[in-house]
Interface confidence: low
């Protein structure tokens, strides 16, 4: 009898243990991706970045996808998601087309119901990067709390892409779930 | 028969309740680290940061350990890091050596294992800080989702240390844990 | 007996998950707050922004208020709060009334026990906004981990509100619970 | 720079109105911090009295809410003191001074006026 | 309301030594508190805040301490021009509070 309740509560408390870390590890899916330099575009219109890194160096993801440039939403929930984005010249790069800049990037999300993409956040700034200085930098930081659908999907978009600075530590976005939705 | 079975049904809740209540607490550390201007260095060459305060105003610290100017990791996990960095001046502290200033912050990873440091994310601006005005701000906001070891360690490097605005709502890095490793 | 003792197992499952499930939502507020550009105040002057959507595209709240222009807390925790602000002028509005410009944030925190505000977060940059040039764009992004109790009031206060971006994706705060205070 | 400079008369006698004036150059009142008063007694002893913050809201020490009252002009960048009822433990020195964003320490300080209640 | 205690209502020292001034808080502050310096015939001037971080341009030989009731602020190689009456203040609560302060004076 009461070894018989014992062994119950044993696999009660197992079987909770082994629920609570599973559904732990199944709620928290996560991705930082860096950017992948090999195939930056180049130019000074805005584009969509297409080449990202997910499993080398700070690069990582699980229970999520990426593809074609995008970070798929594999669990419904609200996640926190996140970029930084690093722009740097330097003149030994050659002259600028124009030193009037405007240095941007717009997180998107991309809804399977609705083929459109909608930005869910941007920053940026206007720069006046003049011959006087040999070198400029400047980075943007943008992040925010969203709702987000299995299939839905996150992509970057920046202006003046041939300015991107390649570094893992520099140019990267990424996204970690919060909590499910109710 | 019934009524120890319903004592053994409370000692699971109640076990589960204290276990659920531990584990969730001692899953999450977190810091949040405000910058110690008493001790901050001079120049405008690059340095570590590593006086911060972790027990007044704003900054706390559970489950992980601030020594020698670095936040240590004692519990594995991926973590949220962020650092905001303040940059000032103004013209009652004197001329600046060189009105182009290069404002950066860098988030550094010491492994154990591997004793050099890594740079997780960086940030900052090129700036020309004309003596035509006669005050000058400028902040950085980086942010990152990150595997941590224990005993791992973070630290903060910036450039143009002297100009930091030494407010704890201005310079400040911290960070918190998401979740366990797989 | 056997049969008795899988009921109550079934019982302390069922319980648990209801339990888990019911904590699990409790314990996470959050807010994602987008600019209600219907009324931004006008000038050059810092402001407190009191009008903020929570229920219209990316604004969303749960277990938290907002309430005469600031996020109320209703559940003590450990928050992690953000804010993203862009100013922005295009020529077509008319000359500022200087080029000179300081575009600040601050994430302010009244307490009810200090009917005072106290600035928990800041970030911004001086500006030289020129006539030559026909647009300026300038983004700001703070983020950080702090200790709320129910009561406390989050707001943002801003410089030159006039210059600010409309669009949800570009002035927004917002906070989400990741612990409980010990 | 900030400056601040306190304005009023030096005598006033019992049971009328003290009114004293703050006068702030290098920033504007409505910018940014709280603006206090604060007094201080013949042996030093300082009271704090009360502030205005930039938005306009106002606190006040619960000891004399009932006889004082801070105000503004924004326009003349200047706040203000309304002090009713002043007996002869009002003689102090009057200071005005500016408080820190995130910290209600004071960073800026006027001279100070002082004032003696006297019949 | 939160009464800030100084003990000493004066202190003597020498140039050179290091002196310790003390404040007690009746109720725990945190670290909600700030010192002043006020020498004869001018207004007090901000010293530290947060209980232990210099205000901009105020000399290292400055240090403050404490937390919760009991603060300390400390003046090492003490100089004549450091004659004055430092006072402490609290600001966890309103109303704002400030210590009876301690003359120091220069043997």
């Known amino acids: 009898g009461s070894q018989h309740i014992r062994a119950e509560k044993a696999m009660v408390d197992g079987s909770w243990l082994d629920l609570a870390k599973r559904s732990k590890l199944e709620a928290q899916p996560f991705a930082h991706l860096t950017i992948n330099a090999t195939d930056i575009p180049s130019g000074s219109h805005k584009v969509s970045l297409s080449s990202w890194y997910h499993d080398r160096g700070w690069a990582k993801i699980s229970n999520m996808t990426f593809s074609n440039g995008k970070l798929i939403v594999n669990q419904d929930g609200f996640y926190y998601l996140y970029a930084n984005i690093c722009f740097r010249h330097h003149e030994t790069s050659g002259d600028l087309a124009t030193e009037y800049l405007q240095l941007m990037v717009y997180v998107t999300k991309t809804s399977i119901k609705i083929p459109s993409s909608h930005t869910l956040m941007k920053g940026g700034s206007t720069k006046y990067w003049s011959g006087n200085s040999e070198f400029h930098f400047y980075s943007i930081n943008v992040g925010g709390f969203f709702k987000l659908r299995s299939g839905e999907e996150i992509s970057i978009e920046v202006s003046n892409p041939s300015l991107l600075d390649p570094d893992q530590d520099a140019t990267y976005f990424g996204a970690f779930k919060v909590r499910d939705i109710d | 028969g019934s009524q120890h079975i319903r004592a053994e049904k409370a000692m699971v809740d109640g076990s589960w309740l204290d276990l659920a209540k531990r584990s969730k607490l001692e899953a999450q550390p977190f810091a949040h680290l405000t910058i110690n201007a008493t001790d901050i260095p001079s120049g405008s060459h690059k340095v570590s940061l590593s006086s911060w305060y972790h027990d007044r105003g704003w900054a706390k610290i559970s489950n992980m350990t601030f020594s020698n100017g670095k936040l240590i990791v004692n519990q594995d996990g991926f973590y949220y890091l962020y650092a905001n960095i303040c940059f000032r001046h103004h013209e009652t502290s004197g001329d600046l050596a060189t009105e182009y200033l290069q404002l950066m912050v860098y988030v550094t990873k010491t492994s154990i294992k591997i004793p050099s440091s890594h740079t997780l994310m960086k940030g900052g601006s090129t700036k020309y800080w004309s003596g035509n005005s006669e005050f000058h701000f400028y902040s950085i906001n980086v942010g990152g989702f990150f595997k941590l070891r224990s005993g791992e360690e973070i630290s903060i490097e910036v450039s143009n240390p002297s100009l930091l605005d030494p407010d704890q709502d201005a310079t400040y890095f911290g960070a918190f844990k998401v979740r366990d490793i797989d | 007996g056997s049969q008795h003792i899988r009921a109550e197992k079934a019982m302390v499952d069922g319980s648990w998950l209801d339990l888990a499930k019911r904590s699990k939502l409790e314990a996470q507020p959050f807010a994602h707050l987008t600019i209600n550009a219907t009324d931004i105040p006008s000038g050059s002057h810092k402001v407190s922004l009191s009008s903020w959507y929570h229920d219209r595209g990316w604004a969303k709240i749960s277990n938290m208020t907002f309430s005469n222009g600031k996020l109320i807390v209703n559940q003590d925790g450990f928050y992690y709060l953000y804010a993203n602000i862009c100013f922005r002028h295009h020529e077509t509005s008319g000359d500022l009334a200087t080029e000179y410009l300081q575009l600040m944030v601050y994430v302010t925190k009244t307490s009810i026990k200090i009917p005072s505000s106290h600035t928990l977060m800041k970030g911004g940059s001086t500006k030289y906004w020129s006539g030559n040039s026909e647009f300026h764009f300038y983004s700001i992004n703070v983020g950080g981990f702090f200790k709320l109790r129910s009561g406390e009031e989050i707001s943002i206060e801003v410089s030159n509100p006039s210059l600010l971006d409309p669009d949800q994706d570009a002035t927004y705060f917002g906070a989400f619970k990741v612990r409980d205070i010990d | 720079d900030v400056q601040l400079q306190e304005s009023g008369p030096d005598l006033v006698k019992p049971s009328q109105s003290l009114s004293l004036t703050c006068t702030v150059t290098?920033?504007?009142?409505?910018?940014?911090?709280?603006w206090h008063w604060i007094r201080q007694f013949p042996g030093n002893k300082l009271e704090w009295m009360d502030y205005?913050?930039?938005?306009?809201?106002?606190n006040y020490n619960p000891s004399l809410k009932s006889r004082i009252s801070i105000t503004r002009d924004t326009s003349k960048n200047q706040f203000f003191l309304q002090f009713i009822s002043v007996t002869t433990e009002d003689t102090a020195t009057y200071y005005c001074?500016?408080?820190?964003?995130?910290?209600?320490?004071?960073?800026?300080w006027g001279q100070g006026t002082s004032v003696t209640v006297s019949s | 309301d939160i009464v800030m205690t100084q003990s000493h209502r004066f202190m003597s020292t020498s140039v050179g030594d290091r002196v310790s001034i003390t404040c007690k808080a009746s109720?725990?502050?945190?670290?909600?508190v700030g010192w002043y310096q006020q020498k004869p015939g001018q207004s007090p001037k901000l010293l530290i805040y947060?209980?232990?971080i210099r205000d901009t341009g105020v000399p290292d030989r400055f240090t403050g301490s404490g937390s919760g009731t009991d603060f300390t602020l400390t003046i090492s190689n003490v100089q004549s021009e450091d004659l004055a009456d430092y006072f402490c203040?609290?600001?966890?609560?309103?109303?704002?509070?400030f210590g009876g302060g301690t003359k120091l004076e220069i043997k």
């Open positions: 001074a500016r408080s820190g964003p995130s910290t209600y320490v004071m960073d800026y």
């Open positions: 290098g920033y504007s009142i409505s910018s940014g911090y709280s």
């Open positions: 205005i913050h930039f938005s306009g809201s106002t």
């Open positions: 109720q725990d502050v945190g670290a909600a």
């Open positions: 947060w209980a232990s």
């Open positions: 203040q609290h600001y966890n609560s309103y109303p704002l509070t």
